[in-house]
Structure formats: C-alpha cells, structure tokens
C-alpha cells in the first residue's frame, strides 16, 4: 500500500475476526494483530526497504518517466503466523499453533 | 503498482540502460523488457494472484474500512535474471549469463 | 599492466612437436581464458583453442584437436601450446591472448615464429 | 562454424577520408540482446589490438575514430577520418561460439 509521504515502513493494523465475517470458523482470538505496509518507496531506495534489483529499475525509470511508470509498492515481505482456536469439520475446537503468514515482519519495496 | 480498473497483471515495460544511468558499466543490452505490475487487487482476489493470507485478510478489511486500510498491492512475486556484458575492473568484457531478479516472471497481490 | 610473454622462435623438422609458453603478469592467472591463435606468413588469424586456468578445462578447434594440447601451470602464471605432427603449413606465428567468458580477445602476447623445414 | 566474410578486401584512401569496412555472418551473432562481434586492428609485424567489442564499443585507449555498427548477421567498422597511422589490415572476429573465427580482413591503406 502506499501512504503519503512517509517511506515503507510496518504500521499497526488491529483486525477484528468478526469485521471479515472469519468469526464464524476462527473461536479465537477474536482480534489480533495483522500489521500492514504503508508508506512510498522514493528514491533511492534505502537498504532497509530491502530492494530487488527490479525495484530499483522501476524507480529510476519512475523518477525519469513519473506519468508512464509507478513507482515500487511497499508491501510485506516477510509474514509471521499466528495461533488460532477453531472449530474443525467435527466441531471440536482445534489450536493451530501456527497460522501461516496471518501477519506483517517485514515490509519492503517491491 | 497500481492501476486504475484493470486486475493485477504483468505488463510489458523496456527499459533503457541509459536512461538509468546504468550505461555506464552495462556493455550490452542498450536495453532489456523488465515488466511491470499494475493493475488493483480487488475482491475476491483471483488464484492467479496467488494471495497471500495477509492479502486476503488485507482486502476484506479494505472492504469494510476503504479509507483506513488499503488494498493489497500488484508486485512482482517472481523475478527472472538476464543476460549482461560489462566491463570488469581489468577493463575486460565479462559476460554474466544470470544478473538475477531484473525481469518479473510472476506478478501478485500482497 | 598486464602483460603476456612468449617463448622465442623455434625451428622445427617435419613429424616434430612444438611447446609455445606464454607466461602472464599484471592480473590474476586463473581470472580468464587464455586463447591461442596463429597466423601462416601473409594470413588471416585462426582461432587454435583456449584454456580455463582456473580448472584447466579446454575449447579446442575440430581443425586442431588431435593435434594440439593446451595446459597451464598455476604456479609460475603460465601457459602452454603444444602442436604435434607438424607439417610445413603449420609455418606461423603462434599468439596468445586472454578475454573473458565473452570472447574477446583484449592483450595478447607478442607473437612466436614457428618455422617448420626439413 | 560460424563463417565471417569481410568486404572490401583492400580499401584504398586518402587522410581525412571516411572508411566503412562490412562484416557478414553465416547466422546471427545477437544472443541475449548482446552481439559478439568484435574488430581488431594488425599494424605489420606486430600482435592484433583490440578494438571494438560487442558490436560498438571502443577498447581501451581507442581513438574515437573508431565505431562500430550493426546487430545480427552485418556488421560495419567506420574510421571517421583516416589518419596515416591507421595503415593495417582489420580483421572481425565472432565470441559467440566456438570455434571462435574470424574474418579473412580488410587492408586499409592511405594514398
């Protein structure tokens, strides 16, 4: 996601399994904490961004051509699980100790 | 990359080495297709942008809050290497057959 | 700068071997491929081979290949081009040269006579 | 193996003249938008000079006289200005597989 005019960084985002209608299968928690990326990747691309090479190409080209090329997006790179309580096909109460990828480590531009 | 009504997909983008700058040690290609991602990440988020947990997540919180939480964002998930001539510290034409993560093979929404 | 030294002229009969040496200062040794190529009096250049010093693997022309070896000694930065069963149109002057995994040719050495009579 | 035809075989001029020397390949020397085509300059009794590599870029110490031109199978070598110290004979080589070959030269002379 872009944001105005701060660079790519991890903010906080609370989401509330009964906001996206997952409440329904997910018991608990009922809200955890997803993380998102905001925030433009400008130039130069600082080494905590974490660059591809073609992200560094699309800035260059960007900065040269602003109308024609977007710029990189900042998004995770890296994504954490959580654990969850749910009910499984029998409708016992199952825990997953690790919901993959539920949650923001790291952001970057890509 | 965003785009405006069209979904998230790999887009045709040549780029010139010398409108980077990069000319100066890139020998050969005087340039080379990179693509681009553009294009949204609407809900439901198609298989073919091989969404991430969080993405989904992302998106169905984007539908309930639009002006809190963004969309997802159309990147490269996949990167290709190309073929480069430069000019070694010796002043020797070198050849490296993988310069890696300079082309997109696969774009996605995360 | 780098430099590539041959070995001097030689005279050879008929049915005979030559060893050209080519001894390489100014850079890493194992860095490129050393490539040899010859030049009959008043010819054009023909490309013989070349050689990876870093582990001795070899491209050899079909035209030469039962005939010439090419070797290396890491240790003293030299190289070698051995042509055997010589005939009189192999009457040439013997070059070394070095370029990269592209092929180029940029510093050769200075160039060995080699005359073949009986 | 790739075939290297190189035209005119003698190219007669007087200083300040432009010189065009073609190059034409039995296949293609373009591989991943590169082209290995390369010129050398042989002044008599002495070793070859790299000059021009990949098509059109000048070797080291090369005076900009020199360019190179074209991609696929033709290729062209321009002095811009014959000085009389480019008296040689130029031949082309390919990089793009082995055996390396080169072209049977051009002889570049001042009148």
């Known amino acids: 996601s872009t944001g105005a005019g701060s660079h790519c960084q991890k903010t906080s985002l609370r989401v509330n399994f009964e906001d996206i209608g997952w409440n329904s299968w997910i018991i608990a928690p009922k809200e955890y904490e997803a993380y998102e990326c905001k925030g433009g990747c400008f130039f130069p691309l600082a080494d905590d961004v974490t660059p591809t090479k073609h992200a560094i190409v699309q800035t260059l080209v960007h900065l040269k051509f602003p109308t024609k090329v977007g710029k990189a997006c900042c998004v995770p790179t890296k994504l954490s699980p959580i654990s969850i309580l749910y009910k499984d096909d029998m409708g016992v109460p199952t825990l997953k100790y690790h919901y993959e990828g539920m949650s923001v480590a790291e952001c970057g531009c890509r | 990359s965003t785009g405006a009504g069209s979904h998230c997909q790999k887009t045709s983008l040549r780029v010139n080495f010398e409108d980077i700058g990069w000319n100066s040690w890139i020998i050969a290609p005087k340039e080379y297709e990179a693509y681009e991602c553009k294009g949204g990440c609407f809900f439901p988020l198609a298989d073919d942008v091989t969404p991430t947990k969080h993405a989904i997540v992302q998106t169905l919180v984007h539908l309930k809050f639009p002006t809190k939480v963004g969309k997802a964002c159309c990147v490269p998930t996949k990167l290709s290497p190309i073929s480069i001539l430069y000019k070694d510290d010796m002043g020797v034409p070198t050849l490296k057959y993988h310069y890696e993560g300079m082309s997109v093979a696969e774009c996605g929404c995360r | 700068q780098v430099q590539l030294v041959q070995s001097g002229a030689e005279v050879k009969k008929p049915g005979a071997s030559v060893k050209v040496s080519c001894k390489a200062s100014?850079?890493?040794?194992?860095?490129?491929?050393m490539h040899w190529v010859r030049q009959a009096p008043g010819q054009g250049l023909e490309w013989m081979g070349e050689i990876n010093p870093s582990q001795g693997g070899t491209n050899y022309n079909e035209k030469f290949k039962s005939r010439v070896t090419m070797t290396v000694d890491k240790s003293i930065s030299t190289a070698y081009m051995e042509l055997s069963r010589l005939r009189s149109d192999d009457t040439a002057v013997y070059y070394c040269?070095?370029?990269?995994?592209?092929?180029?040719?940029?510093?050769w050495g200075q160039g060995t006579l080699v005359t073949v009579s009986s | 193996e790739i075939v290297l035809t190189q035209s005119p075989a003698t190219l007669s001029l007087s200083p300040g003249e432009r010189a065009t020397l073609s190059c034409r390949a039995s296949?293609?020397?373009?591989?991943?938008?590169?082209?290995?085509m390369n010129w050398f300059q042989q002044k008599p009794g002495q070793a070859p000079r790299f000059l021009i590599y990949?098509?059109?870029n000048q070797g080291s110490g090369i005076p900009a006289r020199f360019s190179g031109s074209g991609s696929g199978t033709d290729f062209t070598l321009t002095i811009s200005s014959l000085q009389p110290e480019d008296t040689a004979v130029y031949f082309c080589?390919?990089?793009?597989?082995?055996?390396?070959?080169f072209g049977g030269g051009t002889k570049v002379e001042i009148k």
């Open positions: 080589q390919q990089s793009k597989e082995v055996p390396r070959t």
């Open positions: 040269a070095i370029g990269s995994n592209y092929g180029g040719l940029v510093y």
């Open positions: 990949a098509a059109s």
């Open positions: 296949e293609s020397l373009d591989n991943y938008g590169i082209s290995f």
């Open positions: 100014g850079y890493t040794f194992t860095r490129y491929w």
